[in-house]
Each structure stands twice: as C-alpha cells, then as structure tokens.
Interface confidence: low
Amino acid sequence: FERTRSLQDPCSNCPAGTFCDNNRNQICSPCPPNSFSSAGGQRTCDICRQCKGVFRTRKECSSTSNAECDCTPGFHCLGAGCSMCEQDCKQGQELTKKGCKDCCFGTFNDQKRGICRPWTNCSLDGKSVLVNGTKERDVVCGPSPADLSPGASSVTPPAPAREPGHSPQ
C-alpha cells in the first residue's frame, strides 16, 4: 500500500479494508486476519463478529465487511442483525414463559416463531367460512352466502386434520 500524501489528514486516503497505522508513519496497512474496516480513513479495524454455537455463519467476514449470522436449526433470529436467537416452537404453538403452548381455539400460528393470532372473521367482509381454521392455519373465507345462486351446490369443506384447540397435556 502506498504512503498517503494528504496534508490535512493523511489517514483520509486509506481505503476500506485498511487502517491508518500510526505506528508505521501513518501508512495504510491491511486489516489483520479476522478484522475489517467498512469505510475509509479508519484508524483501527473492527474485530469480525464470530457466529458460534447457536449462531451460524450466513456471510463470512471480509476485510471490508463484517460477518453476518443467522441461527442454527431450532432457533430463529431476533433483533437487528440477528443479535439474538430465540428458541423455536412448532406450528400451532407459541413460546410462553411456561414453554411452547398450543394455540387456543380460535387462534393459529403458521410459523415456528411469533404468537398465535385470531382466525379471520369472514363475516366482517360479508363472506362465509369455506375451510375451517386449525391451530396451524387460518380459516379460508369463501363467497358470501348471497353470492351463491339458488340451487347451486354448496362446497363441503374438508374436515381439519385435527380438532383445533388445546391438545391434552
């Protein structure tokens, strides 16, 4: 790397991936292994984030950008930049202070994270329930009863795979 020549701030010419090394007459030195500088003019390089244990490496650290982590199976990311991993539950459950709990009747969760949400109220939109909701799936709303012409065969929704509501503990 060339010695910088700016009279005002010799460090300003040091590009990303380097740091301005005061110990070596302000020469732009490359970031050491496992460190990076994402902007120019840095006087130090930042230590790369290590994705260990519950964290899994999504993007390796480079001399100009930090590593990015996600979560190992059984966990999901929380917070900016996946600063935390929270334990998963199953679909049809939500994480509470007493562990993973089944969604109450009338609610569902189609993900391994987050909370149980109420089924859609089809009648609010003037529609009817086409497919019943379960703990894992929202109801499917169909056309309003008025939309069904007289004598038209009504669709019989399939029975849910299992009865929605709490399973015995």
Epitope: G74, M84, C89, C100
Partner: antibody
C-alpha cells in the same frame, strides 16, 4: 412430573443409557435438559434437546454424551464411562429463556472397577 | 470458557434477617438478562426461583428477589426462614448457546 431411571453401578469404559420419563405434559411443548452432580459438588450442565429434536451440549460433554427423545422419554447415553462420571443425573424441563422449571429426583450412576 | 463466580460461600444468616448472594459472570450473559437462580436442598433436585435475572417463578415467595444485568447479578433473600437453609446456584445462558452453573452458595443459620 419427570423421573429419571437407569442409574446403576458400572465399570470404567462401559456405556450406559439413562431415561427421563415425562408425564402430565407433552415433550412437543418443552425443551429438556440433563444436568449432573458429583457427590458433594455443584451442578454441572450436560446438554439439552428442544421441541424439534435438535440437541446442544456443553463443550466438555460433546462426543461422549448423546441426548435423544421419543414421545414420552428423553434418553442420555454416556459412553466410555470413567470414575469422574460418578454422579447423580437430573433431568429438567423448560428452556434456555426461562430456565428449567420441573426436575426429577435424579438417578445415581456409580463408576467403579 | 464462561465462568460464573458466586460469593460468598458459605454465608451465615439469622432467622428474620437478609442475605445477599452475588453472581459474577466472566462475560455478559445472553441478552444481558438470561440468568436464573436455583435452590437445592440435600438429596433433592434443584428448584427454580428466579428467571430472566429478576422474574419470580410461580409459587416462589416474594421474599426472594433477583436483580442485575450483564455480568453482575444478585439474589436477595429477606425475612429469612429456617426452610431457606440450602445451596443456591446461579445459571447463565451465553450467546454461543452455553449454559453454565455457578459454584453454589450455601446458606446456613447461626
């Protein structure tokens, strides 16, 4: 409730499987952990298994200890036993977020030649 | 490796008094608050008292109070009763998914 079983007197280098039986709750709702306590010593975390069956171990227990589960039981397999493994082994219910809220009475493993 | 250091041990107490048990972590626990406290009596399994540093577990008397964040945590037991004689453990969760118990603090009565 949870209850451990399978503890007994074993010889060094043998293997042993301990079983934790869960009743009154579903293992699909709770994470389960194994912890041990040598005579007169403190509690020592071994590892856990989560609702999806994923496992995690303390750095010292990786390799020799294996946690698995069935519908109502959680097993801890210990291989290549040494006298240092002599301890009471506890099974606990809960999770990392909120701690372990329900424990069994423990099962004693004695390793001696 | 992460270490949780508990002080003092043992601690001598008087019925009706207050004891404070400190738990210092060699590095910040997960989310600065993933720390639990357990009570254990001889021949019994641990009993969860506190989780998330300060939340009281169900069925635990409000005489037990947890506080702290990051690397410094405290369990305070007030209005001590004879039944509180036990060993108390802190336990922390760390970002690498490690779960660590402290060495334990024995509470005994004068």
């Amino acid at each position: 409730s949870v209850e451990e079983s399978g503890g007994r007197l074993v010889k060094p280098d043998e293997s042993l499987t301990l079983t934790c039986t869960a009743s009154g709750f579903s293992l699909s709702h709770y994470w389960m952990t194994w912890v041990r306590q040598a005579p007169g010593k403190g509690l020592e975390y071994i590892g856990f298994i989560n609702v999806g069956g994923d496992t995690s171990y303390a750095s010292w227990s990786k390799g020799r200890f294996t946690i698995s589960k069935a519908s109502t039981t959680v097993d801890l397999k210990i291989s290549s036993l040494t006298t240092e493994d002599t301890a009471t082994y506890f099974c606990g219910r809960g999770g990392l977020t909120f701690g372990w809220d329900l424990w069994g009475p423990g099962t004693l493993v004695t390793v001696s030649s | 490796a992460q270490v949780l250091t508990q002080t003092p041990s043992p601690v001598s107490a008087a019925v009706g008094g207050t004891v404070t048990i400190n738990c210092q972590s060699s590095q910040s626990v997960y989310s600065n608050s993933f720390l639990s406290w357990y009570q254990q009596k001889p021949g019994q399994p641990p009993k969860r008292l506190i989780y998330s540093a300060s939340d009281l577990a169900s069925g635990v008397p409000s005489r037990f109070k947890g506080s702290g964040s990051g690397t410094q945590f405290t369990l305070t037991i007030s209005d001590l009763e004879c039944d509180d004689a036990a060993t108390y453990y802190c336990a922390g969760v760390y970002s690498d998914n490690t779960y660590v118990f402290g060495g334990g603090t024995e509470v005994e009565f004068k």
